[in-house]
């Protein structure tokens, strides 16, 4: 593929301010491109701050696409589990806080709150329900607390970050998983079934946390959240590879699983969610 | 909800000017990459243009390059095709529509563009 | 220029199976996304990336893409299912549309 093909894709990615990372298109999402192809590929994952495994379609596509983990790092991960350390305990701002608004591409008007490093404020705005950014706030004081500057210049509170011993990856204080497990996957396997905002009853999959296991549940047509798959089988390709089993207190043992040779669909991306 | 909604549609001669708008509502426009997209009488659709959002980079149809321009005012949530030196064979209904990923999710309801003597 | 061919008329009972082909060199490699117009209307995506179906569109319409040949398959088709259906698909940063099919239901 060529920068040619890169640089006619039409994308629809905020980035953030590139002082913040090694590279600018280390922010843009991963993106497949038009093509069918099944390629394994690593990108930078500016929510989890990792670099992650995805399936290129072969053509198209974005910069933020490497051939192998070590490249991605190299590209997009200087001494990152140290200068994210440095972020908490100097109290800088998270990346996120610089992402625009994002309603997302559903209709439930939810009134949210996001940090505009414009004003250098949190303000409100009508979130609809599903995709979007992390710049996105259930209260007024949580998206202070994360993204405003207090009267010294410094943030009004820390934003809690633990660093993982087991990968260097970071992941929010605020993740709720059994003791058992330890997980490594995308963010939103670990957020619960939400049915959405309207009145269809689709026959939908999530992922259930607590006991490691695809479920079915029953999707109004739009809204809720990314953790909604249409198989089982894709439900388990996306979420349950993320898991690994702690057996005893020092052993890792990764939970078995047979992969199959066919695309992964990266569920921010592939929910496609409107009334027509 | 997601609204296009086109204007600036009209009658005018071949070799003039038209500026069609595209207001748009319901969602984060500067995010997306838009398109225009038209529709001769009677026949089917054809990709005009389109842009990138949040990045400056345009892309014209042949048939069009070096006579349209697309642009868009990000504080005002509108989409423009500026069309000059028009022909006849330019006469059609032209939508605008939203990019989402690879394909086109909400479209307006077009306006339509005459070009005659 | 690249060409996604379609054919000009599909012709169907009410309660049958209508399939409306769209072929091109790239199909095999690239996606399909379908569109119906239905007069005066605009366009509206039937189906994205081969045989995705968005939220608010009937199940009875599934896609496929196999070959050189994507076909929009719509099983049971219903009096309100006549209109005219695109195939549309992206090379090279410029998307491509189908000539389009004039789906007829019958009766």
């Known amino acids: 593929d060529s920068e040619e093909d890169e640089e006619h894709t039409i994308i629809t990615d905020t980035e953030l301010p590139p002082l913040k990372l090694m590279h600018s298109f280390c922010a843009f999402k991963a993106d497949d491109g038009p093509c069918k192809a099944i390629m394994k590929r690593f990108f930078f994952n500016i929510f989890t701050r990792q670099c992650e495994e995805f399936i290129y379609g072969g053509c198209e596509g974005n910069q933020n696409r490497f051939e192998s983990l070590e490249e991605c790092k190299k590209m997009c991960t200087r001494d990152n589990a140290n200068r994210i350390i440095k972020t908490t305990l100097q109290q800088e701002k998270p990346d996120f806080c610089f992402l625009e608004e994002d309603p997302g591409i559903c209709r439930g008007y939810i009134t949210r709150y996001f940090y505009n490093n414009q004003t250098k404020q949190c303000e409100r705005f009508k979130y609809g329900g599903c995709l979007g950014n992390m710049n996105n706030f259930e209260t007024l004081e949580e998206c202070k607390n994360i993204c405003e500057d207090g009267p010294n210049g410094f943030q009004v509170d820390n934003y809690g970050t633990q660093l993982n011993a087991v990968n260097n990856s970071l992941t929010p204080q605020s993740t709720k998983v059994p003791s058992l497990f330890e997980f490594h996957g995308p963010s939103w396997c670990l957020t619960p079934a939400d049915r959405g905002l309207c009145r269809a009853n689709e026959n939908r999959f999530y992922y259930n946390s607590v006991i490691g296991k695809c479920r079915p549940f029953k999707y109004s047509g739009c809204g809720g959240n990314e953790n909604n798959f249409t198989s089982k089988q894709e439900c388990l390709r996306a979420c349950k590879k993320g898991f690994i089993q702690r057996i005893s207190k020092g052993g890792l043992i990764k939970t078995k699983r047979k992969r199959k040779k066919q695309r992964v669909k990266i569920a921010y991306e592939e929910i496609f969610v409107k009334n027509m | 909800q997601v609204q296009l909604v086109e204007s600036g549609g009209g009658l005018v001669q071949p070799g003039g000017s038209l500026r069609l708008s595209c207001a748009a509502s319901?969602?984060?426009?500067?995010?997306?990459?838009m398109s225009w997209v038209r529709q001769a009488p009677g026949k089917g659709l054809e990709w005009v243009s389109s842009?990138?959002?949040?990045?400056?980079?345009?892309y014209y149809a042949d048939s069009v390059k070096g006579r349209f321009t697309i642009s868009r005012d990000n504080s005002k949530n509108t989409l423009y095709l500026q069309m000059n030196s028009l022909r006849a064979e330019d006469t059609a209904v032209y939508y605008c529509?939203?990019?989402?990923?690879?394909?086109?999710?909400?479209w307006g309801q077009g306006t339509l563009v005459t070009v005659s003597s | 220029s690249y060409e996604l061919t379609q054919p000009p008329s599909v012709s169907v009972s009410p309660g049958q199976t209508a399939r409306i082909t769209c072929s091109g060199d790239?199909?095999?490699?690239?996606?399909a996304h379908w569109y119906q117009q239905k007069p005066g209307q605009a366009p509206v995506v039937v189906i994205f990336?081969?045989?995705n179906r968005p939220s608010g569109i009937p199940e009875r319409f599934s896609g496929s893409n196999s070959g050189n040949t994507a076909t929009l398959t719509i099983s049971g088709t219903q009096a309100m299912d006549e209109a005219d259906y695109y195939c549309?698909?992206?090379?090279?940063?410029?998307?491509?549309f189908g000539g389009g099919t004039k789906l007829t239901v019958l009766g």
């Open positions: 990336r081969d045989s």
């Open positions: 790239n199909l095999p490699k690239y996606y």
């Open positions: 549309q698909s992206w090379l090279s940063g410029t998307p491509w």
């Open positions: 842009d990138r959002g949040s990045r400056s980079s345009t």
């Open positions: 319901g969602f984060t426009f500067r995010v997306y990459g």
């Open positions: 529509a939203r990019v989402y990923r690879y394909w086109f999710d909400y």
